[in-house]
Amino acid sequence: EAIQVTQPSVVLASSHGVASFPCEYSPSHNTDEVRVTVLRQTNDQMTEVCATTFTEKNTVGFLDYPFCSGTFNESRVNLTIQGLRAVDTGLYLCKVELMYPPPYFVGMGNGTQIYVIDPEPCPDSDF
C-alpha cells in the first residue's frame, strides 16, 4: 500500500532562524528502518538539506548535520532546521523511505513553505 506523507503547508521561522515542523506518513507500516530526507525545491531544482535513518533503537536523527535535528516516534518525525536566514526562505519537502524489511516504499510530502525574516539589527545605544 502506498504511503502518503503529510507536512504543514507553511511555517514561520523564529527570530533566531529556527523552523520546526512535523512530517508524518500513513499508513503506519511495521518498519525497522525509516530514512527521512529534507529537500529544498527552488524552481525545478531539488537539493538535499539533510538526511538520516531512524530505527527502533535510534530515534534521534541528523547527527551528521549541524543545521538539522529530528526525533522519530511511530510514523511521525519532528524536524527542526536551524541557522536559517532570509535567503533560505523556500519550499522544504519531506521524503520518507521505508527501507527495511522489504518491500521498499517511498513517499514525498507536498512541501512546507518556510518563511525566514532576518531580525532587524539592534540600533546603537547612546550612553
Epitope: 502506498a2 528502518e33 529537500l39 521524503k95 527501507m99 527495511y100 522489504p102 518491500p103 521498499y104 517511498v106
Partner: antibody, heavy 119, light 108 residues
C-alpha cells in the same frame, strides 16, 4: 560524462553461474543507488535488483530472489550481479542503470550485456 | 506488486501527428513516482519523463507527461521521424520497480 559499461555476459548451461560487472565512471558512484534491468529477446523491460548507495539495502524481483545477488565495490566504482542456478527464462540482455538521486528512476543506462542460458 | 498496463499496444501514425500513450497502475503509489522511457531497436532505453510530468535533461518539449493516482499519459505533440520507437512506463514508488509492457509507435 556518465558512463556505464557492462561485461561478463555469455552462453551458460542451465543450473550454472555467471557474474556480471558494470564499470561506472563520470560521477560519484558511492552517492547513487544502482540497478540491474533485463530484457528478454523481443520482450519488454524487467527490473531485477537494486543496491543502495552504501550497499546496505538490496531489493530483488521475486523471480530471482535466492538465486541472484547484487553487490558493489565503491572503491573501484563497480556494480556486480552474481547469478546462480540460471534458468532458460533468465536469457536476456542485462543493463545496469543509475538510480536518480531523488527517486529510483533510471537516468543513465549501460549498453547491456547478453546472457544466454541454453543447454 | 504494482502491475502497469499500457495502451494501445501499437500506435500507427504519420510524422507530424500527435500521439497519446496511456499507462494505468493496478493500485496507486506515492507522489506520482512514474517515469517514461523511449527505446529504439538495439539501444538501451532513454529517460524521457520522471515524477509523472517532469522532462529529463535534453528531452524536447514536444514530450509531456501528465496524470496522478493510477492513470498516467505520455503525449508527443508532433511526431518527428526519430520518435518512432517503443515507450515504457515505470513506477518507482515501491519495490519491485515495475515496467509496463510497452507501446510501440510505428510509421503508418
Amino acid at each position: 560524462q556518465v558512463q556505464l559499461v557492462e561485461s561478463g555476459g555469455g552462453v551458460v548451461q542451465p543450473g550454472r553461474s555467471l557474474r556480471l560487472s558494470c564499470a561506472a565512471s563520470g560521477f560519484t558512484f558511492s552517492s547513487f543507488g544502482m540497478h540491474w534491468v533485463r530484457q528478454a529477446p523481443g520482450k519488454g523491460l524487467e527490473w531485477v535488483a537494486v543496491i543502495w548507495y552504501d550497499g546496505r539495502n538490496k531489493y530483488y524481483v521475486d523471480s530471482v530472489k535466492g538465486r541472484f545477488t547484487i553487490s558493489r565495490d565503491n572503491s573501484n566504482n563497480t556494480l556486480y550481479l552474481q547469478m546462480n542456478s540460471l534458468r532458460a527464462e533468465d536469457t536476456a540482455v542485462y543493463y545496469c542503470a543509475r538510480g536518480e538521486f531523488f527517486g529510483e528512476f533510471f537516468d543513465y543506462w549501460g549498453q547491456g550485456t547478453l546472457v544466454t542460458v541454453s543447454s | 506488486e504494482i502491475v502497469l498496463t499500457q495502451s494501445p499496444g501499437t500506435l500507427s501514425l504519420s510524422p507530424g501527428e500527435g500521439a497519446t500513450l496511456s499507462c494505468r497502475a493496478s493500485q496507486s503509489f506515492s507522489s506520482n513516482y512514474l517515469a517514461w522511457y523511449q527505446q529504439k531497436p538495439g539501444q538501451a532505453p532513454r529517460l524521457l519523463i520522471y515524477g509523472a510530468s517532469s522532462r529529463a535533461t535534453g528531452i524536447p518539449d514536444r514530450f509531456s507527461g501528465s496524470g496522478s493516482g493510477t492513470d498516467f499519459t505520455l503525449t508527443i505533440s508532433r511526431l518527428e521521424p526519430e520518435d518512432f520507437a517503443v515507450y515504457y512506463c515505470q513506477q518507482y514508488g515501491t519495490s519491485p520497480f515495475t515496467f509496463g509492457p510497452g507501446t510501440k509507435v510505428d510509421i503508418k
